[in-house]
Amino acid sequence: YFGKLESKLSVIRNLNDQVLFIDQGNRPLFEDMTDSDCRDNAPRTIFIISMYKDSQPRGMAVTISVKCEKISTLSCENKIISFKEMNPPDNIKDTKSDIIFFQRSVPGHDNKMQFESSSYEGYFLACEKERDLFKLILKKEDELGDRSIMFTVQNED
């Protein structure tokens, strides 16, 4: 069971300092941006991280949403990342959900975060290059210290 708590607005970057944003096609991509580019591209660069209390504490349970024309929420259905047109729900009556991730700081690096899927244990949000695109994907942690699954989260409130 997950119950919604408070939300915060954040900019998410990978460790190469590329900014996560939502493209016109509602797809999450990373791109090099100056701070001014990041501001100019809002709200596509501003993510709503909603925190949830968890009946089985396993880290900070969160959803990641964006509000452009409508609110869309990040999903990892069958390990394919997409933004689905939906508000983060107030309650989720399950111990796993495609939209719930556990946000944890990387041991020894308090400013670096990782997001583990609640649906797929051991799978993390990651930034990987596929063809020309730096995509947000879901990836199994295959090695300790894998930088692709680490992010910085900068609060914008």
């Epitope: 493209d23 016109q24 096609g25 797809r27 991509l29 259905e77 069958n78 390990k79 394919i80 990342i81 997409s82 596929e130 063809r131 020309d132 695109l133 995509k135 994907i137």
Partner: antibody, heavy 120, light 108 residues
Framework: QTQLQESGPGLVKPSETLSLTCTVS??????????WGWIRQPPGKGLEWIGS???????YYSPSLKSRVTISVDTSKNQFSLKLSSVTAADTAIYYC????????????WGQGTLVTVSS | EIVLTQSPDTLSLSPGERATLSCRAS???????LAWYQQKPGQAPRLLIY???IRATGIPDRFSGSGSGADFTLTINRLEPEDFAVYYC?????????FGQGTKLEVK
């Protein structure tokens, strides 16, 4: 709704170059999240991916056809093109253009296809 | 390069029956980039399923995809007359795409 339309000669002589163009309407070819692909199907046979292009001009080709294929894009005309050199009868096929979605790398919108026959 | 092998080549069933089509990859897929298409005579292929099991927009729920590793299945419950067609699986890996050779679903 994005639509794709193939155009080009239906008959090409052996050893010559096959040239086709795909015109995209109802959406910009310059979208960040789509690639634009060519797929062919010999009569009565299966689908074969030829290659894909990004609006920036980056290309990705099937290893089996790479030495003979060139795909190019013209963003000002919202078109992309296929050239296949040194054709033989084995290149006779229906040629499809399609939009490839990068979220799961699938071809979600297709042209209706054009039959190209290689014969003297 | 990953090779996809579909079986059977032809499947003969009657309307109302369940069809099970198989697609086997030559190695385990590192990502769930496995899709299924339907093609009817004289038409372009149509995307049915992507990400192994996610139905494309407008696809009826009698179509379902499953599988993991290197073995994947397209199941069509309660076959309708319009479901008789050729079905292809498709995979993306390391910038390249490939299709299986197809399974023809015909009326028994």
């Amino acid at each position: 709704q994005t639509q794709l339309q193939e155009s080009g000669p239906g008959l090409v002589k052996p050893s010559e170059t096959l040239s086709l163009t795909c015109t995209v309407s109802g959406g910009s070819i310059s979208s960040r999240v789509y690639y634009w692909g060519w797929i062919r199907q010999p009569p009565g046979k299966g689908l074969e991916w030829i290659g894909s292009i990004y609006y920036s001009g980056s290309t990705y080709y099937s290893p089996s056809l790479k030495s003979r294929v060139t795909i190019s894009v013209d963003t000002s005309k919202n078109q992309f093109s296929l050239k296949l050199s040194s054709v033989t009868a084995a290149d006779t096929a229906i040629y499809y253009c399609a939009r490839e979605d990068s979220s799961a790398w699938v071809f979600e919108h297709w042209g209706q296809g054009t039959l190209v026959t290689v014969s003297s | 390069e990953i090779v996809l092998t579909q079986s059977p080549d032809t499947l003969s069933l009657s309307p109302g029956e369940r069809a099970t089509l198989s697609c086997r990859a030559s190695q385990i897929l590192s990502r769930n980039y496995l899709a299924w298409y339907q093609q009817k005579p004289g038409q372009a292929p149509r995307l049915l399923i992507y990400g192994i099991s996610i139905r494309a927009t407008g696809i009826p729920d009698r179509f379902s995809g499953s599988g993991s590793g290197a073995d994947f299945t397209l199941t069509i419950n309660r076959l309708e007359p319009e479901d008789f067609a050729v079905y292809y699986c498709q995979h993306y890996d390391n910038s390249l795409c490939s299709f299986g050779q197809g399974t023809k679903l015909e009326v028994k």
